[in-house]
């Protein structure tokens, strides 16, 4: 006999880095007929919600008005359908961005490299920081971890016009505390004539909807959502 | 067309700092990254650090740590290069370089120390 | 840090003859590669960049290859202006590095 229900998916809208002072909300879908969800916060009971009626709702949601460092962390959500509880999400890290400062980030030998040549992105910021984050625009939610005192190296390559795109970075105060963002760098990746149609650019954002940072969801489907955020947030583990 | 200019030479005394200025024209001052590299006499080439303008950003050769310092003055679009606690080792030809791929390069400054 | 074996250290040619130069990369450098000319009197110009992309104005006998971790510089006929100083220099991981150098001297 069951002695678990499957596990719910997790996941934040618009998405896991959540500017400070913005809303973001954490969903979690689970099965219809579940009576009850509780969202915990770093292991503990955070929120719990009975969706009316069960039977015609598999997912909830958790509302946070303003996004502040005590908010940020990692949060998983369970249900229970009658008597019997599901096993626990996978583990939201749910991030605030845009505290303190401002990093400055540049690219060696420079944003139009030819295909085959090796790329050093560059990230620096002066204040008390050792961990640094690159991030490229886009679907495919890639995110590189560098360390160093007040820069760090983040090398890429030899490159294919599959890393063309828009790159920033971020330094981290802690796991789940980071800086704004900084100005997006273009890499232009090009000679790869024959690949170039295989290696699509990912979609990019406006310069004004960068609050959305790496996702894009064209289908609508709420688990592709959560396995973007997922893919991303391993990443960063 | 791109012009890195830099003082043909200098003598300084042992223990003393010297700062090589290397002028730029012709391209966006704060686009390239500008390398620096040292050359002694009847040697090869090697490797100092580069700067770039716009991010202040920099980056040196572990050997160069503590000896050589990177600046930049955009107003004037003149990358510098200080050398500290200078000794006979450090009498060489420096030279500056324009973009990451050195595209460009300024005809060089001899150093010369000697008491 | 990636080091730069340039060979020949020197060699002797003659006018109109096809000659290479090679330098070998002892970690993947990818197509970050350029070689540089240096004349007598200290002026250094970049011929090859990327590999195997001429700079503009460099005359067309000067080309670029690679084959693995070796890195050459070929030219196809040489002229006197040519007999110079030539390295190679690799700008694919820090600390940049140049090979030792090549003195392409007249037969």
């Known amino acids: 006999q069951q002695q678990t229900l499957p596990k719910p998916f997790i996941w934040a809208e618009p998405h896991f880095m959540v500017p400070k002072e913005k809303q973001v909300t954490i969903c979690c879908q689970g099965n219809y007929g579940a009576v009850e969800y509780q969202l915990h916060f770093e292991g503990s009971l955070f929120a719990v919600d009975r969706p009316k009626p069960p039977e015609r709702i598999n997912k909830v949601q958790f509302y946070i008005p303003d996004m502040n460092s005590r908010m940020a962390g990692q949060y998983s959500c369970i249900y229970r359908v009658g008597e019997l509880w599901s096993e626990p999400s996978n583990l939201l890290d749910l991030v605030v961005t845009e505290m303190y400062d401002t990093p400055t980030l540049s690219v060696h030998p420079g944003p139009e490299v030819i295909s085959g040549e090796k790329v050093t992105f560059y990230c620096r910021l002066d204040t008390a920081t050792s961990m640094f984050l690159l991030l490229k625009e886009g679907r495919s939610s890639h995110v590189q971890r560098g360390y160093g005192k007040v820069q760090a190296e983040f090398p890429l390559g030899p490159v294919t016009t599959a890393h063309r795109g828009t790159y920033r970075c971020f330094g981290s105060y802690n796991n789940h505390a980071w800086s704004f963002p900084s100005e997006p760098v273009k890499l232009l990746v090009t000679g790869d004539i024959e690949n170039t149609s295989l290696a699509p650019e990912d979609p990019t954002f406006p310069a004004d909807t960068w609050g959305t940072y790496l996702l894009t969801t064209e289908t609508g489907l709420q688990k592709d959502h959560a396995l973007w955020d997922h893919t991303a947030q391993n990443l960063l583990r | 067309q791109v012009q890195l200019q830099q003082p043909g030479s200098v003598l300084v005394r042992p223990g003393a700092s010297v700062k090589l200025s290397c002028k730029a024209s012709g391209y966006t001052f704060t686009s390239s990254w500008m390398h620096w590299a040292k050359q002694r006499p009847g040697q090869g080439l090697e490797w100092i650090g580069h700067i770039h303008p716009n991010s202040g950003i920099s980056n040196y050769n572990e050997k160069f740590k503590g000896k050589a310092t990177l600046t930049v003055d955009t107003s004037s679009s003149t990358a510098y290069v200080d050398l500290s606690s200078l000794t006979s080792e450090d009498s060489a030809v420096y030279y500056c370089?324009?973009?990451?791929?050195?595209?460009?390069w300024g005809a060089g400054t001899t150093v010369t120390v000697s008491s | 840090d990636i080091q730069m074996t340039q060979s020949p250290s020197s060699l002797s040619a003659s006018l109109g003859e096809r000659v290479s130069l090679t330098c070998r990369a002892s970690q993947d450098i990818g197509s970050s590669l350029n070689w540089l000319q240096q004349e007598p009197d200290g002026t250094i110009k970049r011929l090859i960049y990327a590999t195997s992309s001429l700079d503009s104005g460099v005359p067309k006998r000067f080309s670029g290859s690679r084959s693995g971790s070796d890195y050459s510089l070929t030219i196809s006929s040489l002229e006197s202006e040519d007999f110079v100083d030539y390295y190679c220099?690799?700008?694919?991981?820090?600390?940049?590095?140049f090979g030792g150098g090549t003195k392409l001297e007249i037969k």
């Open positions: 220099l690799q700008y694919a991981s820090s600390p940049w590095t």
């Open positions: 370089a324009r973009g990451g791929r050195f595209d460009d």
